[in-house]
């Protein structure tokens, strides 16, 4: 097993709509054909898997159907979409990227991206 | 609240193994920092060994280089410290050790820690 070098964003604040999405990128070492993408987030001392998913190169990432995540691959990048945020989600982000296939294997870590979610106010009734 | 504990223990003969689990309650091991400490009697404690969040790096005191090995069972959120070939010396106390560090250092043992476990007795003896 071989370390790998990920970017990401220190700080990115989610949308209203408790959407939050960042970069993600690797320095790969060769030319990987399979890659693995996972999002991990950290709070409280723990470390939780928030998705997954496995791509080839070329191809679009696929998580499962009922994954909070989306995303979009361009070489050495992944873009990453995170929906359906609230406050309590408010956490440390990261990512975690493995070349699979061919070998050698490469695992790669990125700092984390400090995700801040804001719950909306709620609109006050109107007399209209 | 994550709490470590260790099991494993025993009296085991000059030569022998034994397999120490340090293992989590109330929580998981997931990209822990994860350091094995010993005391014997009337000694101080001491760092025997260690392994990274990642599982990619280990490190050994100088005592138990080539007999002691670190690892990492994720399925089973425990971390093993395999002993072989022991000696008399190893007798103590052997404590597990935790902390969860910042991704960048996910690679990296931890300076200090911030979670002990209660220790399991090793001795050996004929």
């Known amino acids: 097993c071989k370390a790998m070098h990920v970017a990401q964003p220190a700080v990115v604040l989610a949308s209203s709509r408790g959407i939050a999405s960042f970069v993600c990128e690797y320095a790969s070492p060769g030319k990987a054909t399979e890659v693995r993408v996972t999002v991990l987030r950290q709070a409280d001392s723990q470390v939780t898997e928030v998705c997954a998913a496995t791509y080839m190169m070329g191809n679009e990432l696929t998580f499962l159907d009922d994954s909070i995540c989306t995303g979009t691959s361009s070489g050495n990048q992944v873009n990453l979409t995170i929906q359906g945020l609230r406050a309590m989600d408010t956490g440390l982000y990261i990512c975690k990227v493995e070349l699979m296939y061919p070998p050698p294997y490469y695992l790669g870590i990125g700092n984390g991206t400090q995700i801040y979610v804001i719950d909306p106010e709620p609109c006050p009734d109107s007399d209209f | 609240e994550v709490q470590l504990v260790e099991s494993g223990g025993g009296l085991v003969q000059p030569g022998g193994s034994l397999r120490l689990s340090c293992a989590a309650s109330?929580?998981?091991?997931?990209?822990?920092?994860i350091g094995w400490f010993r005391q014997a009697p009337g000694k101080e404690r001491e760092e025997v060994s260690c392994?990274?969040?990642?599982?990619?790096?280990?490190n050994y005191a100088d005592s138990v280089k080539g007999r002691f090995t670190v690892s990492r069972d994720n399925s089973k959120n425990t971390v093993i410290l395999q002993m072989n070939s022991l000696r008399a010396e190893d007798t103590g106390v052997y404590y597990c050790?935790?902390?969860?560090?910042?991704?960048?250092?996910?690679?990296?043992?931890?300076?200090?820690?911030?979670?002990w476990g209660q220790g399991t007795q090793v001795t050996v003896s004929s």
């Open positions: 392994i990274s969040g990642t599982g990619l790096r280990t």
């Open positions: 050790t935790g902390k969860l560090l910042h991704p960048s250092l996910w690679s990296a043992c931890a300076n200090e820690y911030d979670l």
């Open positions: 109330g929580g998981t091991l997931d990209y822990w920092s």
